[in-house]
């Protein structure tokens, strides 16, 4: 697994470098997670043909994966910093159950899957420090999450491969949108 941000050899060799600002740390953290997702997608796509065939194969998706919408205030038109930040944090909290599902879904990238999960938890903490309106952030219900996790794991092998692909694709898109929005803040 890649070394988490702030722990690479360059940091050790450059003790006089200015410490990262909160925004820089968040930016670096998201890029680190995106690198991890890329590695996981590589294994998924090599293992099956889901990545090419998912569009034709899938008729309906009821996974309810978090997605950015116009009303969330994260796009350039209608940009709203506070609304957007709440959406990013809420979305990441909703993704946590899907990231939990991804553990045990990878053979050669097991550590990478764990790194993505743990780095996302750290990212949420960074963002929560940045948010002024923490009351607006709804935390997913643990019982609902437990039930969803059971359903995800009860799917047959083919559907689990498809689910893995869809989660990674959606998480990548969500993080990319988040990164663009946070750079405007």
């Amino acid at each position: 697994a890649p070394v988490p941000p702030g722990e690479d050899s360059k940091d050790v060799a450059a003790p006089h470098r200015q410490p990262l600002t909160s925004s820089e740390r968040i930016d670096k953290q998201i890029r680190y997670i995106l690198d991890g997702i890329s590695a996981l997608r590589k294994e998924t796509c090599n293992k099956s043909n889901m990545c090419e065939s998912s569009k034709e194969a899938l008729a309906e998706n009821n996974l309810n994966l978090p997605k950015m919408a116009e009303k969330d205030g994260c796009f350039q038109s209608g940009f709203n910093e506070e609304t957007c930040l709440v959406k990013i944090i809420t979305g990441l909290l909703e993704f946590e159950v899907y990231l939990e599902y991804l553990q045990n879904r990878f053979e050669s990238s097991e550590e990478q899957a764990r790194a993505v999960q743990m780095s996302t938890k750290v990212l949420i903490q960074f963002l929560q420090k940045k948010a002024k309106n923490l009351d607006a952030i709804t935390t997913p219900d643990p019982t609902t999450n437990a039930s969803l996790l059971t359903k995800l794991q009860a799917q047959n092998q083919w559907l689990q491969d498809m689910t893995t692909h869809l989660i990674l694709r959606s998480f990548k898109e969500f993080l990319q949108s988040s990164l663009r929005a946070l750079r405007q803040m």
Partner: nanobody
């Protein structure tokens, strides 16, 4: 033990109609996707139609769109396939399929967990 039993197949002339039924037992399929697939001699099993357990949305193969209608009666735990304007190329064994979770609905056979034994449909010209 889950069982899917198809019925309603038979011999029909081109342009005719048939209504296939698939009765499920051993578990409730009301929230699960259900589908119909078919296999003609010497050919691969192909998707015909599917119905969502949640939304009730229906999906069809291009070859049957406008001629076939899939529906379900959750109270009877039964799925139907109304086949109109039948053509000789519709001749095949028709299989009913069910999926146990219902988070994804797919047109791929591997995405289904339970299968019936099939019912023969023969369309003569």
């Amino acid at each position: 033990e889950v069982q899917l039993v198809e019925s309603g197949g038979g011999l029909v002339q081109a342009g005719g109609s048939l209504r296939l039924s698939c009765a499920a037992s051993g578990r409730t399929f009301s929230s699960s996707p259900m589908g119909w697939f078919r296999q003609a001699p010497g050919k691969e099993r192909e998707f015909v139609a599917a119905i969502s357990g949640r939304s009730g949305n229906t999906y069809y193969a291009d070859s049957v769109k406008g001629r076939f209608t899939i529906s379900r009666d959750n109270a009877k735990n039964t799925v139907y396939l109304q086949m109109n304007s039948l053509k000789p190329e519709d001749t095949a064994v028709y299989y009913c399929a069910g999926e146990r979770v219902g988070l994804l609905l797919t047109v791929v056979a591997e995405g289904y967990d339970y299968w019936g034994r099939g019912t023969q449909v023969t369309v003569s010209s």
